[in-house]
């Protein structure tokens, strides 16, 4: 099993739609279950975007390039929720997302109709297939939701900006 999310980071505007893409290939001939999971940041990322990240976090991440203080922590230290799941042609939204314009399209892409402030975080595309427990079954994209200030100076470097 191989799962790939082509965009590692994405910036989108508040109240605008966005699509988080996900591709997968599998040796299994059985239908796959697609699940998108949301994980909050380990610590507040907005502070960093405004130039207020802690010196401790900065020094730690400089010392250890593999570890990111915003992204790397036990799930028990942050919020984890299922956004949506797709089995066959049936898409089911997680309890927290019921009533939102959210669906899974093109096999495994997550389509969000209107972004909210709390949507910033990590989105994991997880594929489950029978007979295939080798390889890579998930990949993630970091989504940052910004308000329309008219200024792009607030943006984190290396984020691809999507203004619809």
């Amino acid at each position: 099993l191989q799962v790939t999310v082509p965009d590692k980071k994405k910036v989108a505007m508040l109240f605008q739609p966005t699509v988080l893409r996900c591709h997968f290939s599998t040796s299994s001939h059985q239908p796959a279950v697609v699940q998108w999971k949301f994980k909050s940041y380990c610590q507040d990322r907005m502070g960093e975007s405004l130039g207020m990240s802690s010196t401790r976090a900065q020094s730690l991440s400089k010392r250890n390039l593999e570890w990111d203080p915003y992204l790397d922590c036990l799930d028990s230290r942050r919020t984890v929720r299922v956004v949506a799941s797709k089995q066959g042609s049936t898409v089911t939204l997680g309890d927290f997302y019921r009533g939102r314009e959210i669906t899974i399209v093109h096999d495994a892409d997550l389509q969000i109709g209107k972004l909210m402030w709390g949507d910033s975080g990590l989105y994991y595309c997880i594929i489950t297939t029978p007979d295939d427990l080798e390889g890579k079954n998930e990949d993630s994209v970091e989504l940052l939701v910004l308000g329309r200030t008219g200024l792009l100076a607030d943006l984190l470097p290396s984020f691809a900006v999507e203004i619809m």
């Epitope: 099993l1 799962v3 279950v33 699940q35 250890n64 390039l65 593999e66 570890w67 790397d72 036990l74 799930d75 028990s76 984890v80 299922v82 799941s85 309890d95 997880i126 489950t128 427990l133 080798e134 390889g135 890579k136 079954n137 998930e138 990949d139």
Partner: antibody, heavy 121, light 107 residues
């Protein structure tokens, strides 16, 4: 064939130290997150530590944090667990374990045979 | 951490019987639950993952079901070699946690 062989267990006094090793073969070790899981005398299974494939991220439960250190040598395909300030409640069979997927949330598809650590005066 | 609870520490059954072992998660874990079998003197062995998928080489008398917080592992026709301790585990969020185990005894 995936193989994982633990060693280094034994009898140690409270407050003592021990270093466990897990020699692996049959897979690309440097691709995988690796785990130490222990089984208490009451047969409860609990995770002890895990480490990212590159070794830069390590995680521990509060019960062992500050006393245990997980590390790896990707050139030698070996996982380690340095245990210090050992307590009687650390007495257990220690297993190294590997998930099925090299990246992603999946259960432990592969386990070593275990090495027994006994902490007793 | 998510707590996994197996309410029965022991279950007694006869060869040929159908037996079900239950596991309850302290919070929603979707379908990310695995079941392991541990025979005396051996390491745990993965049987079921993602609540209902049989791992490679596992006989089809072993099945799993459930989602959310309630999960069931079933052996449709118990064999003498199924004498073991069975553990559930959530693989939804780190740290992955295990149930306390259910020891299956053959009458």
């Amino acid at each position: 064939e995936v193989k994982m062989v633990e060693s280094g267990g034994g009898l140690v006094q409270p407050g003592g130290s021990l270093k466990l090793s897990c020699a692996t073969s049959g897979f690309t070790f440097s691709d995988y997150y690796m785990y130490w899981v222990r089984q208490t005398p009451e047969k409860r299974l609990e995770w002890v530590a895990y480490i990212s494939n590159g070794g830069g991220s390590t995680y521990y439960p509060d019960t062992v944090k500050g006393r245990f250190t997980i590390s790896r040598d990707n050139a030698k395909n070996t996982l380690y667990l340095q245990m210090s300030r050992l307590k009687s409640e650390d007495t257990a069979m220690y297993y190294c374990a590997r998930q099925g997927y090299y990246y992603g949330s999946s259960p432990f598809a592969y386990w070593g045979q275990g090495t027994l650590v006994t902490v007793s005066a | 951490d998510i707590v996994m609870t197996q309410s029965h520490k022991f279950m007694s059954t006869s060869v040929g019987d159908r037996v079900s072992i239950t596991c309850k998660a302290s919070q929603d874990v979707s379908t990310a639950v695995a079941w392991y079998q541990q025979k005396p003197g051996q390491s745990p062995k993965l049987l079921i993952y993602s609540a209902s998928y049989r791992y490679t080489g596992v006989p089809d008398r072993f099945t799993g079901s459930g989602s959310g917080t309630d999960f069931t592992f079933t052996i449709s026709s118990v064999q003498a070699e199924d004498l073991a301790v069975y553990y559930c585990q959530q693989h939804y969020s780190t740290p992955y946690t295990f149930g306390g185990g259910t020891k299956l005894e053959i009458k």
